[in-house]
Interface confidence: medium
């Protein structure tokens, strides 16, 4: 039960995390026009990874879009990548996941499939997170260091009439998104690998048993069937042995060193 | 090194009419949309006109129907006609530019040094 619990809160985190990296990927404020010191202009600039956004004093907002991809800097390529990859991986993941899920049952899949799909989705979680975060990251950094050289120039050229503001971008809402769902899509990676670990099923240890019978050679088979030559009176495969019989979900039998004797 | 300069102020007679240019020069990768202010002698500078990205034009109250920016962005210039003018137009003018350089992401706010426009009998 509480495999299950874990599995899906972390499918459920994993899901609204995603949801935040595509939201952050596609808003226009990741950097945003800090005003401080610049009462004088009457426009208000900010910026996405896709578009550049104007907005007047008369409240009338504009968006144009980044139309080239020859004069962008390497860094604004390389976050834009980051949060596509973190989409994709995510997208998959999530994919993945809604198949290990224990709570859906499709056809006979036996729950080593779903540990594995489950570790699986849980991974692209985390390296999705850790694209988001990065991304964001890198902008912020961008960011940081645009706004330090913009305020050093701000005081070194105040003689007379100045004729270029550096003007000054601080973080937009749109990178609080991106760390907040980063965050979600990695906790959720790490709870889906946890409920990983409750679904694999334990080592079973068979125990050695020989059966002897008599006139036709005998083989055990892993489902408990004796195999008849075919000359037998058992030919219609009846269950001959089921002093170890479990139900499904207490033990899956695996092929091991000690099915045949 | 990006710069704006204008030209085209004088002193014009009320009623009369004047043309204002600024070109932008420098390596310019993006032109977040270009403005005009005034600053009359002893007031605060207001914004005058100004011209979005895609060519959408907004003007001060006061000189609605009067003045007219345009703009060519081949050759990196804006224009502002002024018509009618009036006493109280007189000002010293600027051009500001909101431009992004080459190889940059966020733009940068340019003004120009100024040309003065007088309108008197």
């Known amino acids: 039960m509480a495999v299950t619990a874990c599995q899906g809160l972390g499918f459920v985190v994993s899901l609204i995390g995603i949801a935040g990296i595509i939201a952050a990927t596609c808003m226009d404020q990741w950097s945003t026009q800090d005003l401080y010191n610049n009462p004088v202009t009457a426009v208000f600039n900010y910026q996405g990874l896709w578009r550049s956004c104007v907005r007047e004093s008369s409240g009338f907002t504009e968006c144009r879009g980044y139309f080239t991809l020859l004069g962008l800097p390497a860094m604004l390529q390389a976050v834009r990548a980051l949060m596509i990859v973190g989409i994709v991986l995510g997208a998959i993941g999530l994919l993945v996941s809604i198949f290990a899920l224990k709570c859906i049952r499709i056809g006979s899949m036996e729950d080593s499939a779903k540990a594995n799909m489950t570790l699986t989705s849980g991974i692209m979680f985390i390296v999705s997170g850790l694209c988001a975060i990065a991304g964001v990251s890198v902008f912020a950094n961008m960011l940081v260091t645009n706004f330090w050289m913009s305020t050093a120039n701000m005081y070194t050229g105040m003689g007379g009439m100045v004729q270029t503001v550096q003007t000054r971008y601080t973080f937009g809402a749109a990178l609080f998104v991106g760390w907040v769902a980063g965050g979600l899509t990695l906790i959720g990676g790490v709870m889906m690998c946890i409920a990983c670990r409750g679904l694999a099923p334990e080592e079973t240890n068979y125990k050695a048993v020989s059966y002897h019978a008599s006139g036709h050679s005998v083989a055990y088979k892993p489902g408990g069937f004796k195999a008849s030559t075919g000359f037998g009176s058992n030919t219609k495969n009846k269950k001959i042995y089921d002093g170890g019989a479990r139900t499904e979900d207490e033990v899956q039998s695996y092929p091991s060193k000690h099915d045949y004797v | 090194q990006v710069q704006l300069v204008e030209s085209g102020g004088g002193l014009v007679q009320p009623g009369g009419s004047l043309r204002l240019s600024c070109t932008a020069s420098?390596?310019?990768?993006?032109?977040?949309?270009m403005h005009w202010y005034r600053q009359a002698p002893g007031k605060q500078r207001e914004l005058v006109a100004s011209?979005?990205?895609?060519?959408?034009?907004h003007y001060a109250d006061s000189v609605k129907g009067r003045f007219t920016i345009s703009r060519d962005i081949a050759k990196k210039m804006q224009y502002l006609q002024m018509n009618s003018l009036k006493p109280e137009d007189t000002a010293v003018y600027y051009c500001?530019?909101?431009?992004?350089?080459?190889?940059?992401?966020?733009?940068?706010?340019?003004w120009g040094q100024g040309t003065l426009v007088t309108v008197s009998s």
């Open positions: 500001n530019a909101h431009l992004v350089k080459v190889g940059g992401v966020w733009s940068d706010e340019y």
């Open positions: 420098g390596s310019i990768f993006r032109i977040d949309g």
């Open positions: 011209i979005t990205p895609s060519g959408i034009t």
